[in-house]
């Protein structure tokens, strides 16, 4: 097993709509054909898997159907979409990227991206 | 609240193994920092060994280089410290050790820690 070098964003604040999405990128070492993408987030001392998913190169990432995540691959990048945020989600982000296939294997870590979610106010009734 | 504990223990003969689990309650091991400490009697404690969040790096005191090995069972959120070939010396106390560090250092043992476990007795003896 071989370390790998990920970017990401220190700080990115989610949308209203408790959407939050960042970069993600690797320095790969060769030319990987399979890659693995996972999002991990950290709070409280723990470390939780928030998705997954496995791509080839070329191809679009696929998580499962009922994954909070989306995303979009361009070489050495992944873009990453995170929906359906609230406050309590408010956490440390990261990512975690493995070349699979061919070998050698490469695992790669990125700092984390400090995700801040804001719950909306709620609109006050109107007399209209 | 994550709490470590260790099991494993025993009296085991000059030569022998034994397999120490340090293992989590109330929580998981997931990209822990994860350091094995010993005391014997009337000694101080001491760092025997260690392994990274990642599982990619280990490190050994100088005592138990080539007999002691670190690892990492994720399925089973425990971390093993395999002993072989022991000696008399190893007798103590052997404590597990935790902390969860910042991704960048996910690679990296931890300076200090911030979670002990209660220790399991090793001795050996004929």
């Known amino acids: 097993c071989k370390a790998m070098h990920v970017a990401q964003p220190a700080v990115v604040l989610a949308s209203s709509r408790g959407i939050a999405s960042f970069v993600c990128e690797y320095a790969s070492p060769g030319k990987a054909t399979e890659v693995r993408v996972t999002v991990l987030r950290q709070a409280d001392s723990q470390v939780t898997e928030v998705c997954a998913a496995t791509y080839m190169m070329g191809n679009e990432l696929t998580f499962l159907d009922d994954s909070i995540c989306t995303g979009t691959s361009s070489g050495n990048q992944v873009n990453l979409t995170i929906q359906g945020l609230r406050a309590m989600d408010t956490g440390l982000y990261i990512c975690k990227v493995e070349l699979m296939y061919p070998p050698p294997y490469y695992l790669g870590i990125g700092n984390g991206t400090q995700i801040y979610v804001i719950d909306p106010e709620p609109c006050p009734d109107s007399d209209f | 609240e994550v709490q470590l504990v260790e099991s494993g223990g025993g009296l085991v003969q000059p030569g022998g193994s034994l397999r120490l689990s340090c293992a989590a309650s109330?929580?998981?091991?997931?990209?822990?920092?994860i350091g094995w400490f010993r005391q014997a009697p009337g000694k101080e404690r001491e760092e025997v060994s260690c392994i990274s969040g990642t599982g990619l790096r280990t490190n050994y005191a100088d005592s138990v280089k080539g007999r002691f090995t670190v690892s990492r069972d994720n399925s089973k959120n425990t971390v093993i410290l395999q002993m072989n070939s022991l000696r008399a010396e190893d007798t103590g106390v052997y404590y597990c050790t935790g902390k969860l560090l910042h991704p960048s250092l996910w690679s990296a043992c931890a300076n200090e820690y911030d979670l002990w476990g209660q220790g399991t007795q090793v001795t050996v003896s004929s």
């Open positions: 109330g929580g998981t091991l997931d990209y822990w920092s």
